[in-house]
Amino acid sequence: GRGEVNLLDTSTIHGDWGWLTYPAHGWDSINEVDESFRPIHTYQVCNVMSPNQNNWLRTNWVPRDGARRVYAEIKFTLRDCNSIPGVLGTCKETFNLHYLESDRDLGASTQESQFLKIDTIAADESFTGADLGVRRLKLNTEVRGVGPLSKRGFYLAFQDIGACLAILSLRIYYKKCPAMVRNLAAFSEAVTGADSSSLVEVRGQCVRHSEERDTPKMYCSAEGEWLVPIGKCVCSAGYEERRDACMACELGFYKSAPGDQLCARCPPHSHSATPAAQTCRCDLSYYRAALDPPSAACTRPPSAPVNLISSVNGTSVTLEWAPPLDPGGRSDITYNAVCRRCPWALSHCEACGSGTRFVPQQTSLAQASLLVANLLAHMNYSFWIEAVNGVSNLSPEPRSAAVVNITTNQAAPSQVVVIRQERAGQTSVSLLWQEPEQPNGIILEYEIKYYEKDKEMQSYSTLKAVTTRATVSGLKPGTRYVFQVRARTSAGCGRFSQAMEVETGKPRPRYDTRT
């Protein structure tokens, strides 16, 4: 069986087993044939007529091989005393099993009195003469444990007390717990303990590319079975468990820490160039911020903000913009404003200086608007709004920015007051409005700001017009939009008009003209 090591197996011996028998006329060494008429060797005794039989059959010396407890598996047939005439007083149906330990082969010089009795063995099934037909002999198998053993070897002996008995085979074996890997710990084979209840503690060694989570231990039972696994090993970073081993993460996969988890596919925009990767390297132009976990996707700096518009009010300017179309895969976007003063031309600009005031602040702006005050009157300014995220400072590329140029003055146009809808289609709306009451100069253009209702913070669009009417196209059918208009002069932009809501036409259903 699995986990059993044979010290003796007579079924593998061809011919006489060479055992010691005494006295004479007791046990006989006899070659028989089995049920299939194959030759087998047996030891038989059938001294059933005389009382007080005491016939001994002793094995050769069996080296212990380190076993503390061994098992004797005896296969035998025993004839029913009732099948033999006239022997009821003298015939027995049991025999005794004994053992003797010694540190060397004692040859023929062993004595009955030295042996220790293991057990009296009876047949589960004896047979009568009627069972002999077609050699249907009832084979009995009995197993007995012997131990604890301490000397280098031992003998087993069968004592016949008057039975009609044939010993067909004897297998002496010890049990061991087989070498195995459990919880990624390798346990070497272990010989079982000295008695039937003992447990032998064995410490496991972590397999290659694994490490202890808790000290791995198991206990080898007397039956040769591993019991009570304690502790375990886990695969190291870069390795995952596969069939009791730790295998390197394949290309394109990684594992950042020791543990039970499997290798994970590299996050988006990253790769592993070698097996057993503990992290995945970011693709070109993608980065991982210092606090990003290895499981986070690699990201890149955002594109420039869009729809940057300015509103000049004397020596102040309000800047508004929409978030970048490409946030770079991150949500931690803030904005920085760069102010440049251009006294002569837009090609010759300089920093605005410390007197300029930014509300709420110049850098790390969370919202997409800014008031810049304390500007010089009648001065050209260039404002750059750059979007920044958690990896912008890791990129060597210059930051993308939206630019707006303005000229300060003392008076921008007043608010456009009257605005009305001229026509609304499914995807377009035509608007009409009046000039501001105080243009404060020549109106250079009008700016129409529009967005889906309640979505101004998410996205809005602008359109420029040079007259007091405009058609806004590319709208969604059946959708409510908000429109605002303002005028721009060389002095800057006026305030936006009050919001006007218009709903685009619903799409007409198609009619099936088939009959």
Epitope: H25, V48, M49, S50, I84, G86, L132, G133, R135
Partner: antibody, heavy 121, light 106 residues
Framework: QVQLLQSGAEVKKPGASVKVPCKAS????????MSWVRQAPGQGLEWMGW????????TYAQGFTGRFVFSLDTSVSTAYLQISSLKAEDTAVYYC??????????????WGQGTLVTVSS | EIVLTQSPATLSVSPGERATLSCRAS??????LAWYQQKPGQAPRLLIY???TRPTGIPDRFSASGSGTDFTLTISRVEPEDFAVYYC????????FGQGTKVEIK
């Protein structure tokens, strides 16, 4: 070696008695039963019965009761067949044979050389 | 009592040939059957017991089989010393012999 030794030929008159000895050697006499077999001239074998050498208890086959007696003297390892009131049809060779019981079956494994008993007036 | 019938009464074979002897019981004797060989002027010799078991010293050219009521003794290659009379014997509660089969030289 194991052997059974029987006495020489006997010639008896009708009505007389004869006691045929069978001396065993080479084994423990009381460990094996002893059987008796008759073979009339030119005829086959006839089993007469057997005796338990340990208890002395005899078993007789049909047709061999009354005039035939099995007995023992274990001190000299000898079995005896006594036939009384001899008849002419008792003329035969009488064999003693050791009975062997085994796990796999029984048989008469050792035979004496036979004693010819002739009954003639 | 159980009656054993042997056939044939006489079997003529040449040395080296195969000889097959039969023994039939009037009722089942299971495997409680023995075979004996008897040469002229000699005591019988046990050849087989337990229907098929050969005692130590019996040549392996002798083999036997059967159970219940039909039994066979086979001599695979008859040797000159095998010419003799062969008896079967059952050992139930009462023992009986068959009448014998004579194996003679052809």
């Amino acid at each position: 070696q194991v052997q059974l030794l029987q006495s020489g030929a006997e010639v008896k008159k009708p009505g007389a008695s004869v006691k045929v000895p069978c001396k065993a050697s080479g084994y423990t006499f009381t460990s094996r039963a002893m059987s008796w077999v008759r073979q009339a001239p030119g005829q086959g074998l006839e089993w007469m019965g057997w005796i338990n050498t340990n208890t002395g208890n005899p078993t007789y086959a049909q047709g061999f009761t009354g005039r035939f007696v099995f007995s023992l003297d274990t001190s000299v390892s000898t079995a005896y067949l006594q036939i009384s009131s001899l008849k002419a049809e008792d003329t035969a060779v009488y064999y003693c044979a050791r009975v062997r019981f085994t796990v796999y079956g029984d048989g008469m494994d050792v035979w004496g050389q036979g004693t010819l008993v002739t009954v003639s007036s | 009592e159980i009656v054993l019938t042997q056939s044939p009464a006489t079997l003529s074979v040449s040395p080296g040939e195969r000889a097959t002897l039969s023994c039939r019981a009037s009722q089942s004797v299971s495997s409680n059957l023995a075979w004996y060989q008897q040469k002229p002027g000699q005591a019988p010799r046990l050849l087989i017991y337990g229907a098929s078991t050969r005692p130590t010293g019996i040549p392996d050219r002798f083999s036997a089989s059967g159970s219940g009521t039909d039994f066979t003794l086979t001599i695979s290659r008859v040797e000159p010393e095998d010419f003799a009379v062969y008896y079967c014997q059952q050992y139930g509660p009462s023992w009986t012999f068959g009448q014998g089969t004579k194996v003679e030289i052809k």
